[in-house]
């Protein structure tokens, strides 16, 4: 009886694992083995596929074969007993195009209200993704174990910290990788769960902001308690993208080590041009807080995005505000290359009730004011470019009294 050649051959490639699966064409015939040959593009001869010779099952692994993953290859299979079937040729394919991204490795660390997620490619030193290691991005799904309500977080890198969580609560998550340059989305990792710790005695500092004053950066933050010391650290933002490296060498800002105020001032030349992460920690001598949320700090944007300078012309029922270019040291105006939007906050001097106006124009009218009343105004600039998404700090408040009645014309 002639042996029929096997059918429906499937090639599954996950990371560097090359798996072949096929169907027996004749279940009634026992003791049949299967063998594969392969052929590279531009070659006439067929070569025996190591790992896939005389296979008794309907699956084989040819991961040991050192292929150029960007080069097209062709496979063929036949059944063997006393005689052999004809060859069945599989459609040619390029391994890289066919490959799927496997589940990443996930390592979790817990704080009281945050979880640190370290993500590594599932296959260390992968040949398949050797040229794409730095292009991996990840997305995750996280949920409280008790509720199951899922939150998705897209476009994260090999280290990500999730904040604003509840203490003593179990969170579960799963992560998948993506190579957006090749339109590839990977498979999810197994689910990992971790319980956040009991609430820490000292909360982390909050609302960290960087501004520029003269040739210095001014870093400010808020803190709940007095009589604390603080330290500030920085890290190159690109280091979060480094696959497989989970040693982050945060550096001290020398002028911001053991400071006793909720701000510190350091020269602009501490940082070369680039994007950095900054974080702040508080200590009372006995206890230490966890680190604050990490803020992104772009020296290029920070250098130009200074608080606006403005003049006020007071009328009886309104202010006319004229916004000008901010001044650098030496009183020279700063050239702003980016379109800006202005946020103007004003309030009656005797009240805390603030009102807000957002304007693209540099001349703004603040309406509906009371005559002979002192109002205070502060303003800040925002970039209109979504990618930059940066705000200046607020200018110092300027307070002016409105004129007596009927001077509004």
């Amino acid at each position: 009886k002639n042996l029929k050649s096997p059918q429906k051959v499937e090639v599954d490639i996950i990371d560097d694992n090359f798996i072949l699966r096929w169907n027996r064409s004749d279940e009634s015939v026992g003791n049949v083995t299967f063998s594969f040959d392969y052929q590279k593009t531009g070659m006439d001869n067929w070569i025996k596929l190591s790992g896939c010779q005389n296979i008794t099952s309907t699956k084989c692994n040819f991961s040991s074969l050192k292929l150029n993953v960007y080069e097209e290859i062709k496979l063929r299979i036949r059944a063997e007993k006393e005689n052999t079937s004809s060859w069945y040729e599989v459609d040619s394919f390029t391994p890289f195009r066919k490959a799927q991204i496997g589940p990443p490795e996930v390592h979790l660390e817990a704080e009281d209200k945050a979880i640190v997620i370290h993500i590594s490619p599932g296959t260390k030193d992968s040949v398949m993704w050797a040229l794409d290691g730095l292009s991996f991005t990840y997305s995750l799904v996280i949920w409280k174990n008790s509720s199951g309500v899922e939150e998705r977080i897209e476009n994260i890198y090999s280290r990500h910290k999730i904040y604003k969580l509840s203490p003593e609560t179990t969170y579960c998550l799963k992560v998948k990788a993506a190579l957006l340059t090749s339109w590839k989305i990977g498979v999810y990792s197994p689910v990992h769960c971790i319980k956040t710790t009991v609430e820490n005695e000292l909360p982390p500092p909050e609302n960290i902001e960087v501004s520029v004053q003269n040739q210095n950066y001014v870093l400010k933050w808020d803190y709940t308690y007095a009589n604390m010391t603080f330290q500030v650290q920085w890290l190159h933002a690109f280091l979060k993208r480094n696959p497989g490296n989970h040693l982050y060498k945060w550096k001290q800002i020398p002028d911001c080590e053991n400071v006793k105020t909720t701000q510190c001032v350091f020269p602009q030349n501490v940082f070369q041009k680039g994007i950095y992460l900054l974080r702040v920690q508080a200590s009372d001598g006995n206890n230490t807080s966890f680190w604050s949320e990490e803020i992104k700090f772009d020296t290029e944007i920070q250098a130009f995005l200074l608080p606006p300078v403005f003049n006020i012309r007071s009328l009886s029922d309104s202010f006319h505000i004229y916004i000008g270019a901010p001044k650098q040291s030496g009183n020279t105006p700063v050239i702003q290359d980016y379109p800006l939007i202005y946020e103007i906050i004003f309030w009656e001097n005797t009240s805390n009730a603030e009102r807000k106006i957002i304007e693209k124009k540099t001349d703004v009218t603040v309406p509906n004011l009371k005559p002979l009343t002192v109002y205070c105004v502060k303003a800040r600039a925002h970039t209109m470019d979504e990618k930059l998404n940066k705000s200046s700090v607020f200018s110092d408040a300027v307070c002016e009294k409105t004129k007596p009645g009927n001077t509004s014309k």
Epitope: H107, E109, D112, I194, T197, V198, N200, L247, T288, F290
Partner: antibody, heavy 118, light 107 residues
Amino acid sequence: QVQLVQSGAEVKKPGASVKVSCKASGFNIKDYYMHWVRQAPGQGLEWMGRIDPEDAETKYAPKFQGRVTMTRDTSTSTVYMELSSLRSEDTAVYYCARGGNFYVMDYWGQGTLVTVSS
Amino acid sequence: DIQLTQSPSFLSASVGDRVTITCKASQNVGTNVVWYQQKPGKAPKLLIYSASYRVSGVPSRFSGSGSGTEFTLTISSLQPEDFATYYCQQKNNYPYTFGQGTKLEIK
């Protein structure tokens, strides 16, 4: 494979200084931290400090501040720990250890016994 | 500095026993705790990091758990080669600190 090989045992007089070396192989020291930990006879482990071989930045335990100096020579993949004003309580085995992923001391040297005796 | 207190300091047990060593921190250290095993005349050997992650090559009978201020190292079924001294260490803040050690002896 990763290896940390430390210099040999030393006997020092009180008030003197000792410099212990730790030569690394199998990895690039610039990508890691290098820590020093000591252990007095029959006692527990005590962290002394660490150096970042990339830029020579150091962190010392307050107990040793002013007495310890950690340095490195990246051309020979060697880190050094110098302890000055030695006293008898400094008699201990001194270990270097690599600080790797997740800030963990994952590989250790064989230890160097420093004896301080008059 | 963060104090770590291990208990017990000494522990006698037999091959096949299940043993648990605890480590208490003087303040919340998240999950930034590491466990080492040390045998006489040898350097410490890393067993567990980030409270519960077992180092590649370490037998599965070793497990770690805990977070915040309380941590445990469990050996599910003692083997003759497990008799040694065990140390916990926190890596949450400088200066890094160690527990005083737990000496595990054969009963």
